[in-house]
Interface confidence: low
């Protein structure tokens, strides 16, 4: 029962995590910038992996995709790739884990097969979660270390250019969503791997020995093991391995009014 609960909980946690990873990837608020704080000229900028947006004090919001002539910066592409890989692995993991759930019967699938599928999905969730955490961390690191630009080695300070008016950058909501979602997916994956250990019965190759006592016959199973319906080789669970990954690693803009350039 505990195994089924652990597996089910792992599945649900991973499902929430992957939904969060998808949400974070699609969100526009990866980094935010408040250029003017007074309520009259308040302009709020935020940007995501796919487009940048501006919201004026009037409430008017406009977003525009990153259309570039020479391709997007490598680190942004890397973050996109990590998030997409995380989503794809997570989605496959979810698909596999549905069939692996102990509470779902599919034909005459053995527990050993379900155990293997649970382990596979668990590892996929772990890698998916690590991808998401790595992707979000890369972006956050870019904001912290480069602050403004990616070619920090070209110039000094502010990633290179010298600015005349100070601006303030903050982590966007998507970063926190991504970190939490990645963590949940990773935890769900670990739970699936733990559940896998209990899914496959322990190997018990004990033969029933028949002893004839005086007057009546008793079947005795040595070692005080609980009676089980069958004997034979059951696959024992392998130890779960989980790896770790780290990674790290811009600028702003705003809308002009119609009379602006």
């Amino acid at each position: 029962m505990a195994v089924t609960a652990c597996q089910g909980l792992g599945f649900v946690v991973s499902l929430i995590g992957i939904a969060g990873i998808i949400a974070a990837t699609c969100m526009d608020q990866w980094s935010t910038q408040d250029l003017y704080n007074n309520p009259v000229t308040a302009v709020f900028n935020y940007q995501g992996l796919w487009r940048s947006c501006v919201r004026e004090s009037s409430g008017f919001t406009e977003c525009r995709g990153y259309f570039t002539l020479l391709g997007l910066p490598a680190m942004l592409q890397a973050v996109r790739a990590l998030m997409i890989v995380g989503i794809v692995l997570g989605a496959i993991g979810l698909l596999v884990s549905i069939f692996a759930l102990k509470c779902i019967r599919i034909g005459s699938m053995e527990d050993s097969a379900k155990a293997n599928m649970t382990l596979t999905s668990g590892i996929m969730f772990i890698v998916s979660g690590l991808c998401a955490i790595a992707g979000v961390s890369v972006f956050a690191n870019m904001l912290v270390t480069n602050f403004w630009m990616s070619t920090a080695n070209m110039y000094t300070g502010m990633g290179g250019m010298v600015q005349t008016v100070q601006t303030r950058y903050t982590f966007g909501a998507a970063l926190f969503v991504g970190w939490v979602a990645g963590g949940l997916t990773l935890i769900g994956g670990v739970m699936m791997c733990i559940a896998c250990r209990g899914l496959a019965p322990e190997e018990t190759n004990y033969k029933a020995v028949s002893y004839h006592a005086s007057g009546h016959s008793v079947a005795y199973k040595p070692g005080g093991f609980k009676a089980s319906t069958g004997f034979g080789s059951n696959t024992k669970n392998k130890k779960i391995y989980d790896g770790g990954a780290r990674t790290e690693d811009e600028v702003q803009s705003y809308p002009s009014k119609h009379d602006y350039v």
């Epitope: 980094s31 910038q33 250029l35 003017y36 000229t41 302009v43 900028n45 935020y46 940007q47 940048s52 501006v54 406009e62 525009r64 990153y66 259309f67 570039t68 002539l69 020479l70 391709g71 997007l72 910066p73 942004l76 403004w148 630009m149 990616s150 070619t151 070209m154 110039y155 990633g159 290179g160 250019m161 600015q163 005349t164 008016v165 601006t167 811009e250 600028v251 702003q252 803009s253 705003y254 809308p255 002009s256 009014k257 119609h258 602006y260 350039v261």
Partner: nanobody
Amino acid sequence: EVQLVESGGGSVQAGGSLRLSCAVSGYTYNLKYMGWFRQAPGKEREPVAFIYLGGDNQYYAPSVKDRFTISQDNAKNTVYLQMNSLKPDDTAMYYCAATTALLFLAQTSSWNYWGQGTQVTVSS
């Protein structure tokens, strides 16, 4: 679509001045930054100066800080680059650029729109 047309380039003696202009037309509402890049023969295109179109934010490469000034004239939809105390090292093709992006402005790939460029030659 946004069109950028540069003018004001030419030849000048070291220590002289030039003023580059970049006229912008088309759908400019969503533009957030405009800037000047330059590319010397056999070198990478590098950022020179940027200006935020909604305010007074200006950014300069350290090599041109205190010599170049970027400004905008909203009425004329034009951005200017005033270049003083020019050096032979400043010889390059100067490009006007505009972007809707918020990140990675030091990379040319983050700029959506480019002009054809105007040549600046500084002789010693």
